[in-house]
């Protein structure tokens, strides 16, 4: 079953290569277990950035080596992606699945265009 997912159109990463955005889904029921996946689309290629599952009201659990962190509040997921460089600029799509209880719902956002600008190196001081 389909579900609506909303996310901001554009986000500018900080000078430290950190970008945060909110992924909000219109839950048709009372989900207790949710899976969130962030995918990057660039040059028609789609790659998985990170994925997490969480029980409603709990922290998101990403893999240990994940560049993502996040928190949840109701039907909102606050996602933060770290370690971004200019080459990581692209469309970051939020995918939400309501895993339990049945029925299973799937929603895919339109994507957040994240712009990353590498900081200029500091000039040497004499």
């Amino acid at each position: 079953k389909a579900m609506h997912v909303a996310q901001p159109a554009v986000v500018l990463a900080s000078s430290r290569g950190i970008a945060s955005f909110v992924c909000e889904y219109a839950s048709p029921g009372k989900a207790t277990e949710v899976r969130v996946t962030v995918l990057r689309q660039a040059d028609s290629q789609v790659t998985e950035v990170c994925a997490a599952t969480y029980m409603m009201g709990n922290e998101l659990t990403f893999l240990d080596d994940s560049i993502c962190t996040g928190t949840s509040s109701g039907n909102q997921v606050n996602l933060t992606i770290q370690g971004l460089r200019a080459m990581d600029t692209g469309l970051y799509i939020c995918k939400v699945e309501l895993m339990y209880p049945p029925p299973y719902y799937l929603g895919i956002g339109n994507g957040t265009q994240i712009y990353v600008i590498d900081p200029e190196p500091c000039p040497d001081s004499d």
Epitope: T37, L39, V46, E48, I93, L106
Partner: nanobody, 119 residues
């Protein structure tokens, strides 16, 4: 056109095992993910398990965790569901599904295979 064909269903006693297979045909392709869903008469569709190609990462519904194992053979474009310690509540039609890319959703579905667990 991609086709998914399931097999391996049947009637089994509680505590028994079955191995479902889902073969994809119709071309050479690399799926982002393949999974299994089930639906019992009069009940909502339930997610069972899936596996994502990128890292071979698997995910299971709590109701089957520790009893079911999903695996895939990329060379054969086939995904398997090994079901052990079956319970009467596992009785349902099991459907295989595949998604081409992570942002396409479950693009392709099989016709389903019936699993009946008697007590």
């Amino acid at each position: 056109e991609v086709q998914l064909v399931e097999s391996g269903g049947g009637l089994v006693q509680a505590g028994g095992s079955l191995r479902l297979s889902c073969a994809a045909s119709g071309g050479t392709f690399s799926f982002y993910g393949m999974g299994w869903f089930r639906q019992a008469p009069g009940k909502e569709q339930e997610f069972v398990a899936d596996i994502r190609t990128s890292a071979g990462r698997t995910y299971y519904a709590d109701s089957v965790k520790g009893r079911f194992t999903i695996s895939r053979d990329n060379a054969k474009n086939t995904v398997y569901l090994q079901m052990n310690s079956l319970k009467p509540e596992d009785t349902a039609t099991y459907y295989c599904a595949a998604e081409m890319s992570g942002i396409s959703g479950w693009d392709y579905w099989g016709q389903g295979t019936q699993v009946t667990v008697s007590s």
